[in-house]
C-alpha cells in the first residue's frame, strides 16, 4: 500500500514538473510575442514616419503629376542610358501624352537648352515599327518626326520640342522615369 | 557582353508543335522589349513577334497569329516561342533579338 502511495505521489510530481514545464515555455513564448509585436510596431512607425517625411522624388529628380524625372549629366549610347535608369529604378522616358511631351520640352529649356536625349523608344528594324519598351507603340502624335537613314539600329531621343530618330550608338543624354512616391500615407 | 542563346528546334511533321527558348545575358533582359525573327532558305530576315519588357504587349505577324504564342520569364532572363499546328513555310532558322543583336539561331523544319 505505501508503495503503491509513494508511486502515485512520484506520478503526480512527474506531472507537476511537466506543468511547470509548459508554463514557462507558453511565458516565454508569451514574451516572445510581445517583443516581436513592439519590434513590428517599431517598424512599421518608422516605415510610415519616413514614408511621410520623404519627398515624392529622389534628390535632383523633378516631378510631374505622378511620375519622377531624372535628366542625365553624361552622354551615353542608347543600350547604356537605358541600363543607367534601370539600375535606379527606372527606365528611359516613355511619353504618354501631348502634356507629358510638353512638360519634358519645357523643363529642358530651363535646365539644359537644345540638347539631344535619349527617351526609351526604339524602331524593330524588320517591321520598321517604333516601341516603347514596354511593348507599347507611341501615339501617333508622338512619333519621331524623321526616320533615320541609319542601316544600324534606331533610338528616339527628344531635342527642343520634337521627337527625332538616331543610330543607337551615337552618345547623347537621356531622361530616366519612375513612378513618384505617394506622399499621403 | 550581350549574349541570346535560342535553343528548341528540331524536325516536326505539320500540325506539330514546338517551345523555342532564348537565354539572354549580358544586359538587364527585364528592361527592354524582345523580338523573335526567322530566316528561311535563300529567303530575308522577317520579324515573327515582339514582347514588352513586362510580358505585355505581345504582336505577331499576321501568318503567324493565332499558332504561335511569345512569351517570357524575366526572373530566368528566358524569351520563348511556343509554336502550334506548325506548317511547312514555318520552316526556318529562328534568332531572338535585342537592340539588333541575335545569336546563333536554332533550326526549325517542318516536313513530313
Known amino acids: 500500500k505505501l508503495l503503491q502511495v509513494s508511486t502515485i505521489a512520484m506520478q503526480q510530481q512527474e506531472k507537476l514538473i511537466q506543468q511547470e514545464r509548459a508554463l514557462l515555455n507558453f511565458t516565454e513564448w508569451k514574451r516572445s510575442c510581445a517583443l516581436q509585436m513592439k519590434y513590428c510596431q517599431a517598424f512599421m512607425q518608422n516605415s510610415l514616419s519616413s514614408a511621410h517625411n520623404s519627398s515624392p522624388c529622389p534628390n535632383n529628380w523633378i516631378q510631374n503629376r505622378e511620375s519622377c524625372y531624372y535628366v542625365s549629366e553624361i552622354w551615353s549610347i542608347w543600350h547604356t542610358s537605358q541600363e543607367n535608369c534601370l539600375k535606379e529604378g527606372s527606365t528611359l522616358l516613355q511619353i504618354e501624352s501631348k502634356e507629358e511631351m510638353d512638360f519634358i520640352t519645357g523643363s529642358l529649356r530651363k535646365i539644359k537648352g537644345s540638347y539631344d536625349y535619349w527617351v526609351g523608344l526604339s524602331q524593330d528594324g524588320h517591321s520598321g515599327r517604333w516601341l516603347w519598351q514596354d511593348g507599347s507603340s507611341p501615339s501617333p502624335g508622338l512619333l519621331p518626326a524623321e526616320r533615320s537613314q541609319s542601316a544600324n539600329q534606331v533610338c528616339g531621343y527628344v531635342k527642343s520640342n520634337s521627337l527625332l530618330s538616331s543610330n543607337c550608338s551615337t552618345w547623347k543624354y537621356f531622361i530616366c522615369e519612375k513612378y513618384a512616391l505617394r506622399s499621403s500615407v | 557582353q550581350v549574349q541570346l542563346v535560342e535553343s528548341g528546334g528540331g524536325l516536326v511533321q505539320p500540325g506539330g508543335s514546338l517551345r523555342l527558348s532564348c537565354a539572354a545575358s549580358g544586359f538587364t533582359f527585364s528592361g527592354y522589349v524582345m523580338t523573335w525573327v526567322r530566316q528561311a532558305p535563300g529567303k530575308g530576315l522577317e520579324w515573327v513577334a515582339h514582347?514588352?519588357?513586362?510580358?505585355?504587349?505581345?504582336t505577331y505577324t499576321d501568318s503567324v497569329e493565332g499558332r504561335f504564342t511569345i512569351s517570357r520569364d524575366n526572373a530566368k532572363n528566358t524569351l520563348y516561342l511556343q509554336m502550334n499546328n506548325l506548317k511547312a513555310e514555318d520552316t526556318a532558322v529562328y534568332y531572338c533579338?535585342?537592340?539588333?543583336?541575335r545569336g546563333q539561331g536554332t533550326q526549325v523544319t517542318v516536313s513530313s
Open positions: 533579338e535585342f537592340l539588333g543583336r
Open positions: 514582347i514588352g519588357s513586362g510580358g505585355g504587349h505581345a
